[in-house]
Interface confidence: medium
């Protein structure tokens, strides 16, 4: 959780000839206000696409009336910051759109009139918790000076506001992997001092003087890759005598997810999948209704009129989870065939095909079978940039032109005799064996050693293997 903040410093005519003296010239009094729109990622998007990370509108500024003879001043601006709260992780890369609007206050029939004066779009990388970033942008004849930042709120910390910092008053300490938070230095417990020499990268401690190893590392100071140890796959504090890892708790042990959330391990951490009505790092936030806006990423919230009723988020394409908080990695399903490269553009999937392949999913081989004929009833199969023939029984070779002896591979087991046949081959089994390839021995008591009956056959049913 956190908030994006935008401070407008000035808006006025840009330098150079032809710059307007005022937004209100010859129109009577007017006042300005600003709108900020945040979209995730760095892609160029249509102005009308939703502000998926949020939007905010400033108050309307003081009324401005142009003084004909006076030099053009910086225009009076609305007071305060524009703030766009975000509930989930700060994405780091985003598109910032700032619009400057004019409201004309002359005697208008039907109320005041609005018009858009300027729009600037910046694609930016910005870590949460950093200092104010300053910018100057020109839009047409106008110049806009502004600063912006993203900061975490509540107890969230980190460049994406996804780690939690516990105040000293909380029952549990900061815990493994959580260090004191810069803005809350006094309120978080200082991390314990680990055993001298304990690897900063691969070790950690919860009690002073200990050295616990992250998965994949071992040794008293967590400097030995676990693959060289006989204790591979174990986690936990190092044993002083053996150097082996004693099994310790995994990130999901004890289920850190509250309110019935399910825990899944991620590298070095965990992720909670929350039931409907709960969200947060550990599913700890509850009592949520549509009025709280629990559906992220443009999800549509549907709930009852009763304030205590639950809600359902209908997620837009590309997002999932009970709060539409998870981006679907649609490329993980490997939709691109024949080695095509998958690109998830957000609004659509695109496959970049290897040479020789085409189609939305690279499913068409451009020239494998073009002009290729497979002889003797064989069929051409596309694949791998070269054609292949699937030959009819009794034929083989690249183009099915060679006669194939189905018995050449000696398919009949246990001394069975092979006979070529128009439909393939037939095995005549030696005494004591049965099966299409003479693979099953027949026991003297008459019970065959056939495999267990397949689904749908009971042991007493006739077994049609021959």
């Amino acid at each position: 959780a956190g908030v994006f903040e935008l401070q407008i410093h000035s808006f006025g005519p840009g330098p150079g000839p032809g710059a307007p003296r005022s937004p209100c010239s010859a129109r009577g009094p007017c006042r300005l206000f600003f709108r900020v729109c945040l979209k995730p990622g760095l892609s160029e998007e249509a102005a009308e696409s939703p502000c998926a990370l949020g939007a905010a509108l400033s108050a309307r500024g003081p009324v401005y009336t142009e003084q004909p003879e006076a030099p053009a001043p910086d225009l009076p601006l609305p007071n305060g910051l524009l703030q766009v709260p975000f509930r989930d992780a700060w994405p780091g890369t985003f598109s910032l759109i700032i619009e400057t609007w004019r409201e004309e206050l002359g005697d208008q029939i039907g109320g005041p009139a609005w018009s858009l004066l300027a729009r600037v779009t910046r694609r930016r990388r910005l870590a949460a918790g950093g200092p104010w970033a300053r910018d100057i942008q020109r839009a047409g004849a106008w110049e806009l000076r502004f600063s912006y930042r993203a900061r975490c709120e509540l107890l969230a910390v980190g460049t994406a506001c996804t780690r939690l910092c516990r105040p000293r008053s909380a029952p549990s300490r900061c815990g493994p992997g959580l260090r004191p938070c810069a803005p809350l230095e006094d309120e978080c417990e200082a991390p314990p001092v680990c055993r001298a020499g304990c690897s900063l990268e691969h070790g950690f401690c919860e009690q002073p003087g200990e050295c616990r190893c992250l998965e994949g590392w071992t040794g008293p100071l967590c400097t030995v890759p676990a693959s060289t140890s006989s204790c591979l796959g174990l986690r936990g504090p190092s044993s002083a005598t053996t150097g082996c890892l004693v099994p310790g708790p995994g990130p999901c042990d004890g289920n850190p997810c509250a309110n019935g959330g399910s825990c899944s391990e991620t590298p070095g951490s965990f992720e909670c999948t929350c039931p409907r009505g709960f969200y947060g790092l550990r599913c700890e936030v509850s009592g949520v209704t549509c009025a709280d806006g629990p559906c992220f990423n443009g999800g549509l919230c549907v709930g009852g009129a009763d304030p205590d009723s639950a809600y359902i988020c209908h997620c837009p394409p590309g997002f999932q989870g009970s709060n539409c908080e998870k981006r679907v990695d649609r490329c993980s399903l490997q939709p691109c065939r024949n080695g095509g490269l998958c690109l998830d553009l957000g609004h659509a999937l695109r496959c970049r095909c290897r040479a020789g392949f085409a189609g939305p999913r690279c499913e068409h081989n451009l020239d494998d079978c073009a002009g290729r004929a497979c002889a003797n009833g064989g069929t051409c199969v596309e694949g791998g940039g070269a054609h292949r023939c699937s030959c009819a029984l009794g034929f083989g070779g690249r183009d099915c032109r060679e006669r194939a002896d189905p018995c050449a591979a000696r398919p009949c087991a246990h001394g069975g005799r092979c006979y070529a046949h128009f439909s393939g081959l037939v095995c005549a089994c030696a005494p004591g064996y049965m099966g299409s390839r003479c693979e099953f021995p027949v026991h003297p008591d008459g019970v065959s050693a056939l495999p267990a009956a397949p689904p749908g056959l009971r042991p007493g049913d006739p077994q049609r293997y021959l």
Epitope: C37, A47, A55, L57, G110, P112, A113, W114, S115, G298
Partner: nanobody
């Protein structure tokens, strides 16, 4: 496709109150307006109140200022019109509308029908003396 569905109309005595609701689906651009217009028999459609999505900026016609309040629930994509101290001259068909200022600098009038691209079917309000 954008759909606007009004509800809450009805008959009421002068001095009474009604609350109109307009649920929008398929409508997301957050600098746009949602508003209420009304049309009495034989008269032109006129603006009653409009609100800027996401910003809370509101506009009211002089005839209703102080009596009507427009509000919105962003999470439900719904806009409301609370009508108090109703008068017989408030009798009309009330329409919910959605639209937005053009992005090319052209003028836009929040309380005039032109520029509102999407309209609901309307809900009847009748105030008897």
């Amino acid at each position: 496709e954008v759909q606007l569905v009004e509800s809450g109309g009805g008959s009421v005595q002068a001095g009474g109150s009604l609350r109109l609701s307009c649920a929008a689906s398929g409508y997301t651009y957050s600098s746009n307006f949602m508003g209420w217009f009304r049309q009495a028999p034989g008269k032109e459609r006129e603006g009653v109140a409009t609100i800027v999505s996401g910003g809370g900026t509101t506009y009211y016609a002089d005839s209703v200022r102080g009596r009507f309040t427009i509000s919105q629930d962003n999470a439900k994509n719904t806009v409301y019109l609370q009508m108090n101290s109703l008068k017989p001259e408030d009798t009309a068909m009330y329409y919910c509308a959605a639209g937005g200022p053009p992005t090319n600098g052209a003028k836009w009038y929040p309380l005039r029908p032109p520029g509102y691209n999407y309209w609901g079917q309307g809900t009847q309000v009748t105030v008897s003396s």
